[in-house]
């Protein structure tokens, strides 16, 4: 089948890194500078991706493969193949229409990207706050208040689950 196809279409013999040049009797010509073909039998070469501005070159373009970009320090990749670069913020901040802004009280972000998220509501799980939250860190929930009452021991069976919205008396 391959031989039949090559007799019918001389372009199928052109390897990656070349293109089938219709202007030269379908001779396989090398891809021009700053272009590539990653598969054989192509009639044109694709233009290499250029990494500009906040994009920097992670892998140079070759005659058979496209360039790959990542983001300059201070930015991180978004999208397939790093199609976008988004500015980092500090922990405890999020990127808004006015740039990096501190998380509002009651929210936190422990990464340089993403949005501020609300602190965990310990009472929903019948627990108490062991360590207060900050802009950079979520609260740490501890044992339920009932577990902390005097005389309670580790062998005490767990308290029955409370309905949501009801706090311990």
């Amino acid at each position: 089948f391959e031989r039949t196809r090559s007799l019918q279409d001389p372009c199928s013999n052109c390897p990656a890194g070349t293109f089938c040049d219709n202007n030269r009797n379908q001779i396989c010509s090398p891809c021009p500078p700053n272009s590539f073909s990653s598969a054989g039998g192509q009639r044109t070469c694709d233009i290499c991706r250029q990494c500009k501005g906040v994009f920097r070159t992670r892998k140079e373009c070759s005659s058979t493969s496209n360039a790959e970009c990542d983001c300059t320090p201070g930015f991180h990749c978004l999208g397939a193949g790093c199609s976008m670069c988004e500015q980092d913020c500090k922990q405890g901040q999020e990127l808004t229409k006015k740039g990096c802004k501190d998380c509002c009280f009651g929210t936190f972000n422990d990464q340089k990207r993403g949005i501020c998220r609300p602190w965990t509501n310990c009472s929903l799980d019948g627990k108490s706050v062991l360590v207060n939250g900050t802009k950079e860190r979520d609260v740490v929930c501890g044992p339920s208040p009932a577990d902390l009452s005097p005389g309670a021991s580790s062998v005490t069976p767990p308290a029955p689950a409370r309905e949501p919205g009801h706090s311990p008396q």
């Epitope: 500009k52 501005g53 906040v54 199609s83 976008m84 670069c85 988004e86 500015q87 990127l95 229409k97």
Partner: nanobody, 122 residues
Framework: EVQLVESGGGLVQPGGSLRLSCAVS????????MSWARQAPGKEFEWVSS???????YYVESVKGRFTISRDNAKNTVYLQMSSLRPEDTAVYYC????????????????WGQGTQVTVSS
């Protein structure tokens, strides 16, 4: 061919002013959002300011009230008026298209200028 050419950089004393220009050709400027970014020596790239095609503007907190971004669609030019300059404003300033319309986010298809050096020193 798309071109963005910045000019207007230079050496200025603290408290002084400069006006950067970015002349654009090769695409429809009037419908394009534009932005300025900067990179100080040994520091990371930083988004500075952006302007929608409508003229709506955004600024990073550190330059708000001191820098003004504007555009002249008749001249295919975007400007950055910088006043009350500080030594920490020293950087190479870059003009770029802004296709994402998201502050601090650039797309791989955005175009960038070569940059103009701004030095604030006494």
């Amino acid at each position: 061919e798309v071109q963005l050419v910045e000019s207007g950089g230079g050496l200025v004393q603290p408290g002084g002013s400069l006006r950067l220009s970015c002349a654009v050709s090769g695409f429809t400027f009037s419908s394009s959002a534009m932005s300025w970014a900067r990179q100080a020596p040994g520091k990371e790239f930083e988004w500075v300011s952006s302007i929608y095609s409508s003229g709506k503007t955004y600024y990073v907190e550190s330059v708000k009230g001191r820098f003004t971004i504007s555009r002249d669609n008749a001249k295919n030019t975007v400007y950055l008026q910088m006043s009350s300059l500080r030594p920490e404003d020293t950087a190479v300033y870059y003009c770029a298209t802004w296709k994402t319309l998201r502050v601090g986010v650039w797309d791989e298809s955005d175009y960038w200028g070569q940059g103009t050096q701004v030095t604030v020193s006494s």
